[in-house]
Interface confidence: medium
């Protein structure tokens, strides 16, 4: 009976990249007044939690708390809403949310091939590298929800590197990169030192904030 109602939204507070041992709250919400929310982690068939939905200002929501982040709890999460007591009549699933544990390995280096200050319209390429044998690099930009990822190239001069072509520069931003291994896609290294890319001739480096319902009310259900 899946998909009777439209999908809820699933968010992570303060974010989906979580340091080892730290806390993250997964918030499932909808403008449908769901009585219950179910949180499911992919690949763990019995790993589904159920919470009573809280209703406030035309929104129903539930907060699932991971109180101590470990590798076991990293992975792809989805949530569902239910308007009846039957657990089998649930909404369509939320969009998947990848929760990643970071800080397990040493930080890679991040640099801009033409330097951190570029002219508007100039092509920008950021290079992430490490002597550690990372298979994959992930590049994040402050204010953006999703990371770019690229496989590390073969070892050259003792380092494994990936070059991220960002295209013509329009806005500056703060970038970070992480390394990971193909066998553990949800386990990343420590963050590189942040790299501030400035675009000359560009008056604004502001970023829009995504609109999200408040997560300050309600008692979260603990996962661990």
């Amino acid at each position: 009976h899946e998909g009777v109602h439209r999908k809820p939204s699933l968010l992570a507070h303060p974010g989906r990249l979580v340091k080892s041992e730290e806390t993250v709250i997964l918030q499932c919400w909808s403008d449908v007044m769901f009585e219950h929310f179910l949180l499911h982690r992919e690949g763990m068939f019995n790993d589904t939690l159920r919470l009573i939905g809280e209703h406030h200002d035309g929104v129903s929501k539930a907060n699932f708390s991971i109180s101590r982040m470990t590798q076991d709890l990293a992975g792809t999460y989805r949530c569902y809403g239910s308007v009846t007591h039957s657990p089998y009549q649930v909404s369509a699933p939320s969009d998947p949310l990848d929760i990643v544990i970071i800080g397990l390995y040493e930080k890679p280096s991040l640099s801009a091939q033409l330097g951190p200050t570029v002219l508007a319209g100039e092509n920008v390429t950021l290079s992430c590298s490490s002597r550690s044998s990372y298979d994959m690099y992930h590049l994040s930009r402050e204010g953006e929800a999703h990371e770019r990822r690229l496989p590390a190239g073969p070892k050259v001069n003792g380092t494994f590197q990936a070059d991220f072509p960002l295209g013509p520069a329009t806005h500056g931003g703060t970038y970070r990169c992480f390394g990971s291994f193909h066998d553990s896609p949800y386990e990343w290294s420590k963050s590189s030192d942040p790299l501030l890319v400035s675009v000359t001739g560009n008056p604004s480096n502001s970023w829009p904030s995504p609109t999200e319902p408040s997560s300050k009310t309600g008692n979260p259900r603990h996962l661990h």
Epitope: Q71, D72, L104, Y105, E106, R131, S132, S133, G158, S180, F181, H182, D183, S184, E187
Partner: antibody, heavy 123, light 110 residues
Framework: EVQLLESGGGLVQPGGSLRLSCAAS????????MHWVRQAPGKGLEWVST????????YYADSVKGRFAISRDNSKSTLYLRLTGLRAEDTAVYYC????????????????WGQGTLVTVSS | QSALTQPASVSGSPGQSITISCTGT?????????VSWYQQHPGKAPKLMIY???NRPPGVSNRFSGSKSDNTASLTISGLQDEDEADYYC??????????FGGGTKLTVL
């Protein structure tokens, strides 16, 4: 509580074979890389082999490459090491150890150890 | 690849501080922050004391600390106690994506 229990050691002739097992409990076995480390009598520690949490990646010390094979059965929470072409210098206590993460490349460390099983290669 | 170099033995009196060194190359100790230290009592399995150069696992006394300078890592034990008497091994990641141990250091508490 994390527990690792090795078994399968014993006396074997040069050129012979053995299979060591390590039964794990107290943690989500498939979430962690596992390792074998050995210690010859009166000598220091030597890393032997590593397998990632999924079993998809394996790593070996040069001294055992082509002779030893590491594997795991996540449904049984058990780690294995198949030893073939055994030599006198393979005589050692073999420890299984849990890694820090799933990946288990050389960046790993060993946060829990079993008590070891003794392999003696002698004619 | 040869083992990392550790002194064969060190000693100290109760209450004193001792330091055990672990010397490698730029391809192992010097090149990465993946140095670990293990304590092994006679007839027992090793126990992790320090990881990633200077981090202590839960349950390990804060009398144990780790550091690194260039190609040499160090384990310092302060306020030496009788139960610290054991063998200590360092280990490091290497550029060939393997793990290498030191030869071990026997700590004697006088």
């Amino acid at each position: 509580e994390v527990q690792l229990l090795e078994s399968g050691g014993g006396l074997v002739q040069p050129g012979g074979s053995l299979r060591l097992s390590c039964a794990a409990s107290g943690f989500t076995f498939s979430s962690y890389a596992m390792h074998w480390v050995r210690q010859a009598p009166g000598k220091g520690l030597e890393w032997v082999s590593t397998i990632s949490g999924s079993g998809g990646s394996t790593y070996y010390a040069d001294s055992v490459k082509g002779r030893f094979a590491i594997s795991r059965d996540n449904s049984k929470s058990t780690l294995y090491l198949r030893l073939t072409g055994l030599r006198a210098e393979d005589t050692a206590v073999y420890y299984c150890a849990k890694g820090r993460s799933r990946a288990g490349a050389g960046e790993d460390y060993f946060d829990f150890w079993g008590q070891g099983t003794l392999v003696t290669v002698s004619s | 690849q040869s083992a990392l170099t550790q002194p064969a033995s060190v000693s100290g009196s109760p209450g004193q501080s001792i330091t055990i060194s672990c010397t490698g190359t730029s391809s192992d100790v010097g090149g990465y922050n993946y140095v670990s230290w293990y304590q092994q009592h006679p007839g027992k399995a090793p126990k992790l004391m320090i990881y990633d150069v200077s981090n202590r696992p839960p349950g390990v006394s804060n009398r144990f600390s780790g550091s690194k300078s260039d190609n040499t890592a160090s384990l310092t034990i302060s306020g030496l106690q009788d139960e610290d008497e054991a063998d200590y091994y360092c280990s490091s990641y290497t550029s060939s994506n393997t793990i290498i141990f030191g030869g071990g250091t026997k700590l004697t508490v006088l």
